[in-house]
């Protein structure tokens, strides 16, 4: 409405404060300076705005910054954060870990929105690597966060930052991402001592080779059966009866439960009947005895 | 415990003036935006008035503007409405209601007095 | 101003009956849409905040969705006690509006 556009006697804004709350959605647009909002950004979200106020708002920082905000008018978007589209974010410059902190609060319990990956892209982009202040940041915020990297994204993070990583991070990785960040949780741990390491490495070993296996084999680390479900299929095959007994300890009774489920299965097929009733369990499906066991995938690497 | 009590309604003649107060115990007081609902005989709800928490901000629907009046006493923790020059169509129950977040900026009411009838009559 | 609008503005029902109501705006408001219960003499009650979060103490048998324009309040199974009028209250923008309420009867 043309009559509206310029800012009517005595409404003109000094101050971000809240003398502007009920403020019509015009009267803001005329009212309120682009660049003193800008420079008191942090007041916004102590002040009850409606949405279509912060809808204001936030178009008149887009006309100031077409090029993209400032950090020091980012850091303090708070809840205008969640207006932003990702495009908008596209054009940030995050750099300080305080910013994104701020910006995850934000949206703290909610699930991980288009705005939020992105801003975290371009943070992440912009370090060049997932350093460990970063990810303890992101996996406190989203604990899924780990997993929703590819394996190409993974291998950028130092092993150094698998110190900031806890079993739950870790829930929903798939094998190839366990592949990329068990060796980096290897090279992290490596001068812990044998319990301790174990503690640690668990819930990396869904990415751990036969070889480490055999190895924890020999260092009564009792391996309890969930963390031995999730062991590569054929990581697990080459383990004799005597290395799953020993890896196991008191929990290798757990083994009869799931003897119909992979890995398991699979590592029942490949044992002599003979070694599988060694444990007592009455594991059925093992190779009968007299039976000679061929292993072509051996002779074929040879030829 | 947290609630709303509303005192001052009444009859009074078309032109006259009324004071209707709101006394807020449960909560802090002057960290909330405050309002004044209005339902009329039979009718629906109406957004009157409202006030900052500081009280240094104001609101009134078109329909009320220039002869009520909204303020507060945040050492009393109450709030009121002084209603003047009063209608035929002023006519209703005037209902206080608390927003519900100190912060943020979500704009609904989760506590309200149990309301007070004014009439507006000959 | 946001205009609100009810749908029915008054409906018959039976204890036990799934019950909609539902609310238009005038205008995209994204999901800043709330719904209260009014009963007769009595103040009204927040039952739904952010067209879909249910207020604490409230039954979960109301439900509220939508986005933009249309909203619904649903009852999934009425009780004696939800015999009321309910409102809808848009919070995008000043001045807060109503919509003009749906009164539930009992049939």
């Known amino acids: 409405e043309v009559e509206k556009t310029a800012c009517p006697s005595g409404k003109k804004a000094r101050e971000i404060d809240e003398s502007l709350i009920f403020y019509k959605k015009w009267e803001l647009e005329a009212c309120v300076d682009a660049a003193l909002l800008a420079t008191q950004m942090d007041r916004v979200n102590a002040i009850p705005f409606t949405y279509e106020q912060l809808d204001v708002l936030k178009h008149k920082l887009d006309e100031l910054y077409p090029q993209g905000y400032p950090e020091s008018v980012i850091q303090h978007l708070g809840y205008l954060f969640l207006k932003m589209s990702p495009e908008d974010i596209r054009k940030w410059n995050v750099t300080s870990l305080e910013t994104l902190k701020a910006l995850l609060e934000v949206n703290k319990g909610h699930e991980m929105s288009p705005q939020v990956a992105t801003l975290i892209d371009r943070f992440v982009k912009g370090r060049g690597q997932l350093d460990k202040d970063t990810l303890d940041t992101l996996t406190a915020f989203y604990p899924g966060y780990l997993c929703s990297l590819s394996p190409e994204e993974l291998s950028s993070v130092p092993p150094s930052s698998i110190w900031a990583v806890r079993p739950q991070d870790l829930d929903t990785c798939d094998p190839r991402q366990l592949d990329v960040l068990y060796p980096k949780a290897r090279l992290a741990f490596q001068n812990m001592n044998g319990s301790e390491y174990f503690v640690k490495i668990q819930s990396f070993l869904g990415g751990a080779p036969t070889e480490d296996l055999k190895a924890l084999s020999q260092q009564n680390v009792s391996m309890d059966l969930a963390t031995f479900m999730k062991l590569r299929t054929d990581a697990v095959l080459p383990l004799t009866v005597a290395e799953v007994q020993k890896l196991l300890g008191p929990h290798v009774e757990g083994l009869k439960a799931e003897e119909r489920h992979r890995p398991v299965r699979d590592w029942i097929l490949r044992q002599r009947q003979d070694d599988l009733d060694t444990l007592g369990l009455g594991l059925q499906g093992g190779i009968p005895n007299g039976y000679l066991v061929l292993d072509l995938s051996m002779q074929e690497a040879l030829s | 415990q947290v609630q709303l009590v509303q005192s001052g309604g009444g009859l009074v003649q078309p032109g006259g003036s009324l004071r209707l107060s709101c006394a807020a115990s449960?909560?802090?007081?002057?960290?909330?935006?405050m309002s004044w609902v209005r339902q009329a005989p039979g009718k629906g709800l109406e957004w009157v008035s409202a006030i900052s928490g500081s009280g240094g901000s104001t609101y009134y629907a078109d329909s009320v503007k220039g002869r009520f009046t909204i303020s507060r006493d945040n050492s009393k923790n109450t709030l009121y409405l002084q209603m003047n020059s009063l209608r035929a169509e002023d006519t209703a129950v005037y209902y206080c209601a608390k927003r519900e977040a100190a912060a943020g900026h979500d704009w609904y009411f989760d506590l309200w007095g149990r309301g007070t009838l004014v009439t507006v009559s000959s | 101003d946001i205009r609100v609008t009810q749908s029915p503005s008054s409906l018959s029902a039976s204890v036990g009956d799934r019950v909609t109501i539902t609310c238009r705006a005038s205008q995209s408001i994204s999901s800043y849409l709330n719904w209260y219960q009014q009963k007769p003499g009595k103040a009204p009650k927040l039952l739904i905040y952010a067209a879909s979060s249910l207020q604490s103490g409230v039954p979960s048998r109301f439900s509220g969705s939508g986005s933009g324009t249309d909203f619904t309040l649903t009852i999934s199974s009425l009780q004696p006690e939800d015999f009321a009028t309910y409102y809808c209250q848009q919070s995008y923008s000043i001045p807060l509006t109503f919509g003009q309420g749906t009164k539930v009867e009992i049939k």
């Open positions: 449960g909560f802090t007081f002057s960290s909330y935006a």
